[in-house]
Interface confidence: medium
Amino acid sequence: MEDEKPKVNPKLYMCVCEGLSCGNEDHCEGQQCFSSLSINDGFHVYQKGCFQVYEQGKMTCKTPPSPGQAVECCQGDWCNRNITAQLPTKGKSFPGTQNFHLE
């Protein structure tokens, strides 16, 4: 049992965590949850996780999606469970790309 006496009371959310940064964990705790999609070497890389610091999340979440990366953010316990980030393809397909989940 971890016993703390912090002053700051960050309002934290439980988030689904999927990807290399999660290690063996399937969840994380942060001030925002996210679901992201990026293209690396022709692969669609899906990741989910959390931003520990609100400012960090605020910057990333406000970044508009590009053809190579998209991030969707939310606030609420497990809110990123059913969110899958979408690239702004507008009907265009990217030949030679495959879906790839980093587990």
């Epitope: 049992m1 703390e4 009371n9 309002k11 959310y13 609100y54």
Partner: antibody
Framework: EVQLVESGGNLVQPGGSLRLSCAAS????????MSWVRQAPGKGLEWVSG????????YYSVSAKGRFTISRDNSKNTLFLQMNSLRAEDTAIYYC???????????????WGQGTLVTVSS | DIVMTQTPLSSPVTLGQPASISCRSS???????????LSWLHQRPGQPPRLLIY???NRFSGVPDRFSGSGAGTDFTLKISRVEAEDVGFYYC?????????FGGGTKVEIK
């Protein structure tokens, strides 16, 4: 319907111990942080302690730290407050409160149980 | 610890008339996420408290719209536009921006 029912309050001598319980129903208990708030007779409210939904993180007021221990049994939907080295000033109604989320404390205390009375007197 | 100071201690009001309660914190209540975690609770005699307002001005589910909250920084106000008989009891402000969570001393609202 979300329900919280406290029990375990009693008359105890100074220096004694008591274990309060709070039985929760009507929601997924392990998804929510919980807190204990007390109210001395005729006085205002005082937050005592809180615990995250998974029981990993615990938080205490200055008056509770070192004497009280908050814990939970998620398999039984029950919250506990172990109170040691009790003093006269610990006399109060102790309320169990559901928090807003798993790791969220304060801001959204709802609902409250009916409370259990702890009296510390010789 | 953040100290919450409420005024007045007691507020005798006439049914149908407005009432206002002030709450001042010893330091600013803006959290790292930019929100201000200031709540208001109501406690009728012999009952547990119930949540009225959270994050300064958000009415909790089922709370009548005659209750409203406002303020910023260190000064906050709860207003009841038209007091009804069921509104009697104690009102508490509470901050949850920092641990330990702290309450104001309470304001007693009674009918004249």
């Amino acid at each position: 319907e979300v329900q919280l029912v406290e029990s375990g309050g009693n008359l105890v001598q100074p220096g004694g111990s008591l274990r309060l319980s709070c039985a929760a129903s009507g929601f997924t208990f392990s998804n929510y942080a919980m807190s204990w708030v007390r109210q001395a007779p005729g006085k205002g409210l005082e937050w005592v302690s809180g615990i995250t939904g998974n029981g990993i993180k615990t938080y205490y007021s200055v008056s509770a730290k070192g004497r009280f221990t908050i814990s939970r049994d998620n398999s039984k939907n029950t919250l506990f407050l172990q109170m040691n080295s009790l003093r006269a000033e610990d006399t109060a109604i102790y309320y169990c409160v559901k928090e807003r989320g798993h790791s969220w404390f304060g801001d959204w205390f709802d609902p409250w149980g009916q409370g259990t009375l702890v009296t510390v007197s010789s | 610890d953040i100290v919450m100071t409420q005024t007045p201690l007691s507020s005798p009001v006439t049914l149908g008339q407005p009432a206002s309660i002030s709450c001042r914190s010893s330091q600013g209540l803006v959290n790292s996420d930019g929100n201000t975690y200031l709540s208001w609770l109501h406690q009728r005699p012999g009952q547990p408290p119930r949540l009225l307002i959270y994050e300064i001005s958000n009415r909790f589910s089922g709370v009548p719209d005659r209750f409203s909250g406002s303020g910023a920084g260190t000064d906050f106000t709860l207003k009841i536009s038209r007091v009804e008989a069921e509104d009697v009891g104690f009102y508490y402000c509470m901050q949850s921006t920092q641990f330990p969570l702290t309450f104001g001393g309470g304001t007693k609202v009674e009918i004249k």
